[in-house]
Interface confidence: medium
């Protein structure tokens, strides 16, 4: 990938390596700014009918460095009896999401993009699509 | 959460300042390398007894420009027969996301990482926990 | 609904360079990438290179590195493909093509090209 | 590069048929894999996303199916402004790539 040779934006924006040495405000990392209206731990997890657990992935050098990762707990969905039911399936919703990664050994630190596929959430699924009527 | 420790690999980062100039490879975002094994757009969407549509959200200064967030199509969940069950709730699972905002009028281009939520799907809960048996 | 609009045919001689237009409309420049593809008489697609105007990054086809440049004016909304060193195996159909820069169903990149330019003919004859 | 083989090359189909196009990547490309229609003197136009995702305005009777590296598209019901040369798209790696293209005529 190189950069566009004649932007009307940048004009002497420098070609290959410019992707790779890009400022960036990583300001927001370090904010504690309210999450109060965003941050709700929700305990759908356990209340729906395709209910999920969490596990925690862990690594020091990545920003977000904890990321809670859905897996699904049953290959079927729970009915109103807490039944497992055999024409319904429990799948798991993901979501590419974008993580830093710290590059060790290099001063001042750099920062490189990294895209990971988390599981989200579960969601119940039927073999056939139904709409509601 | 703050990436940078007292360390002694690069002793004089400054902390608050030292975040609104970091160099990141941001290589990843433009490749195209294979993603077969995890790249699956699925039709859960529809097939799930919660369903939900996708909306548009655009901002040509964000990276992703396009977000599509999830709303989930009905309040209630839609049963076997294909008619709405008015015991069990159809919610939205939501995750943050880190974006990128191009800031304007700066050359080169310089970036800064926003936290976003977004709707991710919907999945179906009862008002009460349940357990499989 | 986005537009994309081509300039018009080109009849160029072997050895020759060729600069076609493409000109967007109806949507924001920045929020999509375009990839040109092009079409030999009576044969299929094929894919020569995209730019992605966020970040301001070209992609080429090995087949056309070092032949093909594309580029971008965000002022005009418009994207250019040259390619050089014409040869009679150049006379072909080139398209330019909208590839979406979409966060969609959970996924970071979209890159199905979901609109198309009209076409320019380029003729390379001696 | 990936290499998309479709087939048949060439289908004559009577209206109200079912068509069935396939095609073969020479490897693993998860869902990356996009579906056009080509009319004579015409633009390419998008008509599946992502193996099996429809587009807005594109009638329902095409459908899209597969993963992995076999690919189907399927035209249940065909009718005569269907005439048109089908191509597959795979996104997954640089270069993009097409298949050699399926021309469907109507008997």
């Known amino acids: 990938a190189v950069l566009i040779p004649q932007s009307s934006v940048c004009p002497n924006a420098e070609a290959n390596n410019f992707l790779q040495n890009v400022k960036v405000n990583l300001k927001v990392i370090n904010s504690l700014s309210s999450k109060a209206s965003s941050r709700r731990p929700s305990d759908y997890l356990n209340r729906s009918t395709s209910p999920w657990t969490l596990s925690r992935n862990e690594d020091p050098d990545r920003y977000p460095s904890v990321i809670w990762e859905a897996q699904c707990r049953h290959q079927r969905c729970v009915n109103a009896e807490g039944k497992l039911d055999h024409h319904m399936n429990s799948v798991l919703i993901q979501q590419e999401i974008l993580v830093l990664k710290r590059e060790p050994e290099k001063c001042p630190f750099t920062f490189r993009v990294e895209k990971m596929l988390v599981g989200v959430g579960c969601t119940c699924v039927s073999s056939i699509v139904r709409h509601a009527s | 959460a703050v990436l940078i420790p007292q360390s002694s690999v690069c002793p004089n980062a400054e902390a608050n300042n030292f975040l609104q100039n970091v160099k990141v490879n941001l290589k990843v975002i433009n490749s195209l390398s294979s993603k077969a094994s995890s790249r699956r757009p699925s039709d859960y969407l529809n097939r799930s007894t919660s369903p939900w549509t996708l909306s548009r959200n655009e901002d040509p200064d964000r990276y992703p420009s396009v977000i599509w967030e999830a709303q989930c199509r009905h309040q209630r969940c839609v049963n076997a027969e294909g008619k709405l069950d008015h015991h069990m709730n159809s919610v939205l699972i939501q995750q943050e996301i880190l974006v990128l905002k191009r800031e304007p009028e700066k050359c080169p281009f310089t970036f800064r990482v926003e936290k976003m939520l977004v709707g991710v799907g919907c999945t179906c809960v009862s008002s009460i926990v349940r357990h499989a048996s | 609904e986005v537009q994309l609009v081509q300039s018009g045919a080109e009849v160029k001689k072997p050895g020759e360079s060729v600069k076609i237009s493409c000109k967007a409309s109806?949507?924001?420049?920045?929020?999509?990438?375009i990839s040109w593809v092009r079409q030999a008489p009576g044969q299929g697609l094929e894919w020569m290179g995209g730019?992605?105007?966020?970040?301001?990054?070209?992609d080429y086809a090995q087949k056309f590195q070092g032949r093909v440049t594309i580029t971008a004016d965000e002022s005009t909304t418009t994207a250019y493909m040259e390619l050089s060193g014409l040869t009679s195996d150049d006379t072909a159909v080139y398209y330019c093509?909208?590839?979406?820069?979409?966060?969609?169903?959970?996924?970071?990149?979209?890159?199905?090209?979901?609109?198309w330019g009209q076409g320019t003919t380029v003729t390379v004859s001696s | 590069e990936i290499v998309l083989t479709q087939s048949p090359d060439f289908q004559s189909v009577t209206p109200k048929e079912k068509v069935t196009i396939t095609c073969r990547a020479s490897?693993?490309?998860?869902?990356?894999l996009h579906w056009y229609q080509q009319k004579p003197d015409q633009s390419p136009k998008l008509l599946i996303k992502?193996?099996?995702h429809s587009i807005s305005g594109v009638p329902s009777r095409f459908s899209g199916s597969g993963s992995g590296t076999d690919f189907t598209l399927t035209i249940n019901g065909l009718e005569a402004e269907d005439a048109a040369t089908y191509y597959c798209?795979?996104?997954?790696?640089?270069?993009?790539?097409f298949g050699q293209g399926t021309k469907v005529d109507i008997k």
């Open positions: 093509a909208r590839e979406p820069n979409d966060f969609w169903n959970g996924y970071y990149d979209t890159h199905d090209f979901d609109s």
């Open positions: 490897q693993n490309i998860g869902s990356e």
């Open positions: 798209h795979q996104s997954d790696t640089l270069p993009h790539t």
């Open positions: 992502y193996a099996s």
């Open positions: 109806g949507g924001s420049f920045r929020s999509y990438g």
């Open positions: 730019i992605t105007h966020f970040f301001g990054i070209t």
